[in-house]
Amino acid sequence: QPDSVSIPITCCFNVINRKIPIQRLESYTRITNIQCPKEAVIFKTKRGKEVCADPKERWVRDSMKHLDQIFQNLKP
């Protein structure tokens, strides 16, 4: 029995420069782990692809806001 369970850490090393149209995005995850080299957002697209993006970019923040609104509207 191992003493502790090792949980893999997801980090972003490169981020996308260009906006992905909002119609293609499904969800996002914030990467804030201090063991990662940079703070990032991982967008999951409707095609199942995961793309790293920079939360300092306007389109990234706006897309997150937009997705938050969609999830709010889905709540009963």
Epitope: N17, R18, P21
Partner: antibody
Framework: QVQLVQSGAEVKKPGASVKVSCKVS????????MHWVRQAPGKGLEWMGG????????IYAQKFQGRVMMTEDTSTDTAFMDLSSLRSEDTAVYYC?????????????????WGQGTTVTVSS | DIQMTQSPSSLSASVGDRVTITCRAS??????LGWYQQKPGKAPKRLIY???SLQSGVPSRFSGSGSGTEFTLTISSLQPEDFATYYC?????????FGPGTKVDIK
């Protein structure tokens, strides 16, 4: 606001190549996804290809595969469309088109800003 | 490839008329559709994005509707500057495809 200015008209012989440029101002090219569309005289609009940010690569319409190359010079914010093995059917107006990143709808798919068009005539 | 068909291919109308143009996709494209207006010798201009959202600066007499495979562009009261050719564009699946166009001219 994003603006696109294209190179001037070209006259080419069959079998030759043409390179059309599209200069971006108001934004940097690396933040935009550029598309190319052509229109033959008296005909409709035809999408030739464009940059897919999701995959980080340029997608070409099957019809032009192997004959077209879309490239970028990020140092001058200029996009290029190179079409080779020209034939008379390639006589058309060629447009570049992209997003207007400063409008309320910028999160959506672009092609809402267009260049003025470049006329390419292929004739022997 | 997704085929886009438009009807009618041309129509004659008078100022003040209500005009409806239909675009059909050969398979579902969700709401990934735009409508463009083109005048002779000019670059296309987008009127509608995401099926029904009005591009900023475009008059409210233009509207779009539909989803899946059938889409409509409506001009509620045709103005002299609206005589042009109209195209739909699907950007759901590569290659992106335009409809063949609908020419609106003066009756």
């Amino acid at each position: 606001q994003v603006q696109l200015v294209q190179s001037g008209a070209e006259v080419k012989k069959p079998g030759a190549s043409v390179k059309v440029s599209c200069k971006v101002s108001g934004y940097t090219l690396t933040e935009l996804s550029m598309h190319w569309v052509r229109q033959a005289p008296g005909k409709g609009l035809e999408w030739m290809g464009g940059f897919d940010p999701e995959d980080g690569e340029t997608i070409y319409a099957q019809k032009f595969q192997g004959r077209v190359m879309m490239t970028e010079d990020t140092s001058t914010d200029t996009a290029f469309m190179d079409l080779s093995s020209l034939r008379s059917e390639d006589t058309a107006v060629y447009y570049c088109a992209t997003d207007d990143m400063l409008t309320p709808h910028y999160l959506y798919f672009g092609m809402d800003v267009w260049g003025q068009g470049t006329t390419v005539t292929v004739s022997s | 490839d997704i085929q886009m068909t438009q009807s009618p291919s041309s129509l004659s109308a008078s100022v003040g008329d209500r005009v409806t143009i239909t675009c059909r996709a050969s398979q579902g494209i969700r709401n990934d559709l735009g409508w463009y207006q083109q005048k002779p010798g000019k670059a296309p201009k987008r009127l509608i994005y995401a099926t029904s959202s009005l591009q900023s600066g475009v008059p409210s007499r233009f509207s779009g509707s539909g989803s899946g495979t059938e889409f409509t562009l409506t001009i509620s009261s045709l103005q002299p500057e609206d005589f042009a050719t109209y195209y739909c564009l699907q950007h759901n699946t590569y290659p992106f495809t335009f409809g063949p166009g609908t020419k609106v001219d003066i009756k």
